[in-house]
């Protein structure tokens, strides 16, 4: 949050409120890892290792998508025709879908520097951190690169296209038993 302006990877100790408080690094200081890479498995590169989405609680992530993330994606796309963009990114199973979703949501691409500050992205990050074992740890060690690049949110046509792709990936994530087209 805005209150948490401390040096990266440090926490400051305070007394107060009758309980205990320790302020950690803020999300400003902790941007996600960024890699220009296309994935076809359920793995995400995280420095020297890959994050495997296989053991996530898919039903709880699906519930979070249906109740709130989907609405934020629609809000972001408001004013755009649903036929405006073709879906070019696909996924074959739930771990693979989450790999693609995390890549498109958090990795900067040409023409769309960052979606990570958007509400749907914050909620996606929270859902993965909460219901994918060990995912939060990969975020603690993530690079600081985005901190400088994410001062303002700019909606470009490329970003709209990217979010359109995300909507397709999420829809596919929610229908894991469908045969791949």
């Amino acid at each position: 949050g805005l209150n948490d302006i401390f040096e990266a990877q440090k926490i400051e100790w305070h007394e107060g409120g009758g309980g205990s408080e320790q302020k950690l690094i803020s999300e400003e200081d902790l941007g996600s890892s960024h890699h220009h890479h296309h994935h076809s498995s359920g793995l995400v590169p995280r420095g020297s290792h890959m994050y495997d989405f296989t053991n996530c609680d898919f039903e709880k992530i699906k519930a979070a998508y249906l109740s709130t993330i989907s609405k934020d994606l629609i809000t972001y796309m408001s004013g755009t025709k649903s036929t405006e963009f073709n879906n070019t990114v696909s996924c074959s199973n739930r771990p693979h879908c989450l790999t693609e979703i995390q890549s498109l949501t958090f990795n900067p691409t040409a023409g769309c520097a960052s979606l990570a500050k958007e509400m749907f992205a914050m909620k996606t990050k929270a859902a993965l951190a909460i219901w994918c074992p060990g995912y939060s740890e990969t975020q603690i060690n993530a690079t600081q690169a985005m901190k400088k690049a994410r001062k303002s949110k700019v909606t470009t046509n490329k970003c709209l296209e990217q979010v359109s792709q995300l909507q397709g990936l999420w829809r596919r994530f929610n229908r894991p038993l469908l045969k791949q087209q």
Epitope: D4, D57, K125, A126, I130, W131
Partner: antibody
């Protein structure tokens, strides 16, 4: 400055319910989940569950499923933990603790604790 | 459910001595372990997060190490205020669990 202020001590009869509150201030409420942890007299810490304001959802330790209900009022930045069908072994100090959900990911601020005594 | 086993249950040491506390997980949890200190009548206080990440304001005599299933909290030179109960906790997956604690007492 971050503060988590919990409601006062409670004495309850077996079979009844208790609702403990935890008022947060000094940070953006939706950036953090609110976890509930209890500690029975002379015992270790036991995670009960959490409410995630950003996603408007809760998750529970199966040991408390059906008996514990964790909610929050985002307008007042207050989290609640209600425990029903109380028995003597629910006598404990109940803590709320925040945990970042898009950063930090650890329980870095705790309430002062609420002692709940279950006795006939 | 991931079980965390702390050892020893009690550690009797003198001020100035080194304390080594162990926490073993029942399955691989990478580095998703945090250490807390608790004194009587107080809420737990975070000391180390994600196995070895230090916290400004926490004395640097506290350090953490380990990954996978075996984790260690080390207090290099015990001060009088360090005598307390120490808990490890995992946030690798729900349900979050705590170890049973190690009491560090004055010898």
């Amino acid at each position: 400055q971050v503060q988590l202020v919990q409601s006062g001590p409670e004495v309850k009869k077996p079979g009844s319910s208790v609702k403990v509150s935890c008022k947060a201030s000094g940070y953006i409420f939706t950036d953090y989940a609110m976890h509930w942890v209890r500690q029975r007299p002379g015992q270790d810490l036991e995670w009960m569950g959490t409410f995630i304001p950003l996603l408007d959802t809760s998750d529970y330790n199966q040991n408390f499923k059906g008996r514990a209900t964790i909610t929050a009022d985002k307008s007042t930045s207050t989290a609640y933990m209600e425990l029903s069908s109380l028995r003597s072994e629910d006598t404990a100090v109940y803590y709320c603790a925040r945990m970042g959900v898009t950063h930090s990911y650890v329980m870095d601020a705790w309430g002062q604790g609420t002692l709940v005594t279950v006795s006939s | 459910e991931i079980v965390l086993t702390q050892s020893p249950g009690t550690l009797s040491l003198s001020p100035g001595e080194r304390a080594t506390l162990s926490c073993r997980a029942s399955q691989h949890i990478s580095r998703s372990v945090h250490w807390y200190q608790q004194k009587p009548g107080e809420a737990p206080r975070l000391l180390i997060y994600f196995a070895s990440q230090s916290i400004s304001g926490i004395p640097d005599r506290f350090s953490g190490s380990g990954s996978g299933t075996d984790f260690t909290l080390t207090i290099s030179r015990l001060e009088s205020e360090d005598f307390a109960v120490y808990y490890c906790q995992q946030s690798y997956s729900f349900p979050y669990t705590f170890g049973r604690g190690t009491k560090v007492e004055i010898k």
